[in-house]
Structures are given as structure tokens and as C-alpha cells.
Amino acid sequence: MAVTACQGLGFVVSLIGIAGIIAATCMDQWSTQDLYNNPVTAVFNYQGLWRSCVRESSGFTECRGYFTLLGLPAMLQAVRALMIVGIVLGAIGLLVSIFALKCIRIGSMEDSAKANMTLTSGIMFIVSGLCAIAGVSVFANMLVTNFWMSTANMYTGMGGMVQTVQTRYTFGAALFVGWVAGGLTLIGGVMMCIACRGLAPEETNYKAVSYHASGHSVAYKPGGFKASTGFGSNTKNKKIYDGGARTEDEVQSYPSKHDYV
């Protein structure tokens, strides 16, 4: 039961995280005009990975896409790449994890296959989360650098009297969404990896003891009502040794707390 819960929770947390990464990537507010210690403007500028926008106090908003690839800063391209890789890996991870979920039965898929798929999706979620966190952090670092550069020459005097105000940009909402989403995806991935350990079959082979009764070839196997005819194919390494009421999920104990990244 604990494995199913851990796996299910990992899937849900990762799903929320990946939805957040997608949302952050699409959001326009990666950087927003810094309003602190600035003249009050009737125009508010904000920028995303794909377009820049201007919202006037009249309520009119105009957005312009970056219709160039070569003209964009390399850092911005890198951030775009990291976010897209994160989304792609996360989407594949979600697809794999759906089939790996213990609560979903697909044909005669073995537990070992489900364990492998759970581990694969977990690793994908971890890498996806790290890509998102890295992408957002690179962009944030870029903003901090530009912020202090523009602060150094915020007012560039022109002929003494006339001044040009340089627009400074600070962290937008998308950065926080990205950090949280990346963290959630990472946590979800870790949970999937933990769940994988519980799904993996044990190596020890518990041999059944056969009692031959006259006239019938019946193999009795301790472990509750798990008896079958001698022709059964129950030779796989299944944990049917325990006669207690516990399910196989409860055999292994797991840490109950996970550190948030």
C-alpha cells in the first residue's frame, strides 16, 4: 500500500510540476519593469521567453514576439532550450509513469517491468525538474547582472538638462512559478525512484514444500489460500511466503519525509 501511495503521490506531484513548467515557459512575465525607486510611469514593461509586452495605464496591452533567432542573446536561447528539454522529458516521464502505476493493470505486465518504468520516469522527472530550475536560475542571474549594470548608469545625462530613464527589470512571476514547478517535479521524481525500490521483486527464492497425498498431486504452499494444482506455473519468484495479513507493499518501510529542493 505504501508503495502504491508513494508512486501515486509522486505521479501527481510531478504532473503538477510539469504543468507548472509548461505554464512558466509560456508566461510573459519572466522579467518585469522595476517600479521601486523609479519615476512613476504610465507604461509597464514586461518580458517573457517568446515575446515582450507593454501595458499602458489606459488598459491597452501590446505584445510583440521575438521574430528572430540569431538576434537573440545566447543566454535566452539557452533558457528556452532548458525549459523545452524539461517539458519534453517531463511529458515522456508522465507517459511512462502512467503505464508504471501499480493501480493500473496492463495485460500481464510484471512487477519488475513496472519497477523499471517507475525508475525511468522518476529519473526523467528529476532531470526535467533540474532543467527547469537551471533555466529559471540562468535567467534570474542574467536579470541580476543587467539590473546592477543599468543601476550604475540609470540616468544617462544628455546635455545636462535632458535625461533618459533606463528601464530596469526585476524578477517576474514566471521565475517563481518555474522554481516551484521545477522543485515539485524533482520531488515527484525522487518519490517515483523511492517507489521503484518497493516494486522491485526480491532476489531470494522461497521454495515451496510439496506434500504428496495419495491419488492427487497437490502442492501446498503456506501463505493463506494460495494453493494450486501441481500443474500450475507458479514457479516465479513471488512473495507468497508470509502467512500474515500484511500485503507485499508493507514489507519494506520507507522514509516518511522528503527534503524540498
Epitope: 518580458q47 495605464s57 528601464t167
Partner: antibody, heavy 118, light 113 residues
Framework: EVQLVESGGGLVKPGGSLRLSCAAS????????VSWVRQAPGKGLEWVST????????YYADSVKGRFTISRDNAKNSLYLQMNSLRAEDTAVYYC???????????WGQGTSVTVSS | DIVMTQSPSSLSVSPGERVTMSCKSS????????????LTWYQQKPGQPPKLLIY???TRESGVPDRFSGSGSGTDFTLTINSFQAEDVAVYYC?????????FGAGTKLELK
């Protein structure tokens, strides 16, 4: 057709109060930023105050800050200007205007006259 | 506050003449985000409320005759009337629409010669 009709002007003593109203029609009032602009007799235009749509941020000219309060009632499609501690220099025709692209004031009312005199 | 300086303060013009008036701001009205200048021109005829002519320094408002044109960037702006007509007699105001308070220039009065 866009219409802005001001009312509430009149003669008031210095230190007195007055509340101007502006009834808007012909456009989606709740989505528009609206402003008050005044013009003293024989003088130029002076921006007084602006209230934005949505969150309703308010902005005031330094000359009226702390004395005038702009507000809006989207349900009634109305804009208001509460004027307290009135001075002789507040005597003017007060125009209600709508903000447009570029923050330009594209529609103006006919104005309401405010006279502050003892 | 942003100071808007208009010149000349008044001008006598003959019909058909080309008119130019200037407006200077104490700070740049160019927004780096969209590369637009937040300067507006208005026309006010005697006894009437002002009328919007040009916004974003050079975009003509719908219904405004094409003889009116705006130009300039940053701090220096110009309103041009290509062929002055009798009905253009009015006071023309420029306005800073970038910084609060949204200041107006003192106006340029156009009279018929």
C-alpha cells in the same frame, strides 16, 4: 456613441467641498482608465487625476494631492472627483476624459464649471 | 515633474501655408519596451473641449485629416499642418503621457493671418 457627461459643478467658498460626477456611456466603462483634466479661465490644460481599470490605481497632480479623491462605480458607469479644502486656484472647467492607446485622452465631456470664491 | 515646452506660443498663418510647431520634454518619452514615444497632440477650438489629434507621437487618430502629422522622438517633437485651413484655427497642446503627472505644454495658438 461614446458620451461623457459631467455634473456637480458650482460656486463654493474657499475651504469648502464639492463632488463632481461623470456619467459614461457608449463604451465598456469598467475596462477603461478615466481621468479628470481642468482648465482655468483663459489658461491652458492641467491634468488632475487618473483612475485605472481593474485594480483601480489612482494618480494625482501634486497641486491636488491629499485634497482631491478620484473614484469610480463600474456598476453605475460613473466617475467621481471628491474635492475638499478648495482654493481659489481650483477655479476651472473640469473635464471628464477617457484614456485610450498611448494613454491619450480620446473622448472628453463638455465640462462642468467650478468656481471657488468668497 | 516633466516640463513640456511648446514653441512658438502663437502663430499667424495664411490658408494653404505649411505650419510646424515644436514641443520639447525635459525627459525622454521613448519607452524602450515597444520603442514608442508617449507624446500626444490635442486641438482645442474656442468654447469646445480639446480633441485628440495624434498619439504615440506620430499615430493619427481616426477621423483626423491627413494634413496633420506628428514626428520626433525622445525629447523633441513636431506637429505639422501641411496645408493650413481656416477651420484649423485653435490652440494646440502637447502632452507627456509617459510619466505621472501627465503634464501638458502651455499650448501654441494658431490664428488666421
Amino acid at each position: 456613441e461614446v458620451q461623457l457627461v459631467e455634473s456637480g459643478g458650482g460656486l463654493v467658498k474657499p475651504g469648502g467641498s464639492l463632488r463632481l460626477s461623470c456619467a459614461a456611456s457608449g463604451f465598456t466603462f469598467s475596462n477603461s482608465a478615466v481621468s479628470w483634466v481642468r482648465q482655468a479661465p483663459g489658461k491652458g490644460l492641467e491634468w488632475v487625476s487618473t483612475i485605472t481599470s481593474g485594480v483601480s490605481y489612482t494618480y494625482y497632480a501634486d497641486s491636488v494631492k491629499g485634497r482631491f479623491t478620484i473614484s469610480r462605480d463600474n456598476a453605475k458607469n460613473s466617475l467621481y472627483l471628491q474635492m475638499n479644502s478648495l482654493r481659489a486656484e481650483d477655479t476651472a472647467v473640469y473635464y471628464c476624459t477617457r484614456q485610450f492607446k498611448g494613454n491619450a485622452l480620446d473622448y472628453w465631456g463638455q465640462g462642468t464649471s467650478v468656481t471657488v470664491s468668497s | 515633474d516633466i516640463v513640456m515646452t511648446q514653441s512658438p506660443s502663437s502663430l499667424s498663418v495664411s490658408p494653404g501655408e505649411r505650419v510646424t510647431m515644436s514641443c520639447k520634454s525635459s525627459q525622454s518619452l521613448l519607452n524602450s519596451g515597444n520603442q514608442k514615444n508617449y507624446l500626444t497632440w490635442y486641438q482645442q477650438k474656442p468654447g469646445q473641449p480639446p480633441k485628440l489629434l495624434i498619439y504615440w507621437a506620430s499615430t493619427r487618430e481616426s477621423g483626423v485629416p491627413d494634413r496633420f502629422s506628428g514626428s520626433g522622438s525622445g525629447t523633441d517633437f513636431t506637429l505639422t499642418i501641411n496645408s493650413f485651413q481656416a477651420e484649423d484655427v485653435a490652440v494646440y497642446y502637447c502632452q507627456n503621457d509617459y510619466f505621472y503627472p501627465l503634464t501638458f505644454g502651455a499650448g501654441t495658438k494658431l490664428e488666421l493671418k
